[in-house]
């Protein structure tokens, strides 16, 4: 059984202010069971951007159906980007538990925000 990998194919993404940013992430295995979460930054101060199973994230939508059996595409789209959204985003796989246990993180995708074209 191959070891789970979390793949973020783009090291960086540049988006104009006001547009939407797509952050890509795929997993190589459905096992073990557990959610994907997206964070900005690392360490204890990291910011939760999206949780696959719970919470309300009005600017974030999954690119693929998170409820679909066998879905391994955990890419997200963030709307109405502002300069405050700049940073490095990590797609992180957790193992289901009480609480969920962090298993593996993607390498991160740096989001840079360009000035809105005049």
């Amino acid at each position: 059984e191959e070891e789970l990998q979390v793949i973020q194919p783009e090291k960086s993404v540049s988006v104009a202010a006001g547009e939407s940013a797509t952050l890509n992430c795929t997993a190589t295995s459905l096992i073990p069971v557990g959610p994907i979460q997206w964070f900005r930054g690392v360490g204890p101060g990291r910011e939760l951007i999206y949780h696959q199973k719970e919470g309300h994230f009005p600017r974030v939508t999954p690119v693929s159906d998170p409820t679909k059996r066998n879905n391994m595409d955990f890419s997200i789209r963030i709307s109405n980007i502002t300069p405050a959204d700049a940073g490095t985003y990590y797609c992180v796989k957790f193992r289901k538990g009480s609480p969920d246990v962090e298993l593996k993180s993607g390498a991160g995708t740096e989001l840079s925000v360009r000035a809105k074209p005049s």
């Epitope: 459905l30 096992i31 693929s64 159906d65 409820t67 679909k68 059996r69 066998n70």
Partner: antibody, heavy 124, light 106 residues
């Protein structure tokens, strides 16, 4: 009790269009994916289309791809199947189904409830 | 399509197993009972082994490797029906088996 009531069947003309509606009750409609399944006379079950609980994601069987549109109105607890360019092969009983808290459209292993069905006959 | 036997038979009180294979990798199976053509199917097992509240405990489901199994213990005459399995293939499309006719002898 969970109920799924289909309507909109009947005699249809080849090349025409039909619109089937399923009204759900007895459960939190917006929390469950829904599917349409059909059964031609004397044949087995065939998956037609499915839709995620929030309506953002839709799925279609090969036999109706490009001719069908599935949609839902969670406020009205309804799911609709529109099928265009009808053929004789679309003659069947169409069942509305509910997923039981797992999976999405196309995940037939998750179906936990069925409607009574509505009969569609495509004939000139 | 999923693969299931065309027919099985059992005497009342016996245990019968119906198998289903061909679903996508890591997928689950559901089982649907249809007592007569044109009558609405009834879910007896979903998500491999979950049983709707109105289904007797004589019905159980399991999955080993990529094969799903419906087990009916203490078979009764009223269990005579066609049983369909359902799942999704690797592309995510819904698929059914062709159906297994259960005949209760005697």
């Amino acid at each position: 009790a969970v109920t799924l009531d289909e309507s909109g069947g009947g005699l249809q003309t080849p090349g025409g269009a039909l619109s089937l509606v399923c009204k759900g009750s007895g459960f939190t409609f917006s929390s469950h994916a829904m599917n349409w399944v059909r059964q031609a006379p004397g044949k087995g079950l065939e998956w037609v289309a499915g839709i995620s609980s929030d309506g953002r994601f839709t799925y279609y069987g090969a036999a109706v791809q490009g001719r069908a549109t599935i949609s839902r109105d969670n406020g009205q607890s309804t799911v609709r199947l529109q099928l265009n360019n009808l053929r004789a092969e679309d003659t069947a009983t169409y069942y509305c189904t509910k997923n039981g808290g797992c999976g999405s459209g196309g995940d037939l292993d998750c179906i936990d409830a069925w409607g009574h069905g509505t009969e569609v006959i495509v004939s000139s | 399509a999923l693969t299931q036997p065309a027919s099985v038979s059992a005497n009342p009180g016996e245990t019968v197993e119906i198998t289903c294979s061909g679903g996508g990798s890591n997928n689950a199976y559901g089982w649907f009972q249809q007592k007569s053509p044109g009558s609405a199917p009834l879910t007896v097992i979903y998500d491999n082994g979950k049983r709707p509240s109105d289904i007797p405990s004589r019905f159980s489901g399991s999955k080993s490797d990529s094969t799903g199994t419906l087990t009916i213990t203490r078979v009764q005459a009223e269990d005579e029906a066609v049983y369909y399995c359902g799942s999704a293939d690797n592309s995510g499309a819904g698929v059914f088996g062709a159906g297994t006719t259960l005949t209760v002898l005697g």
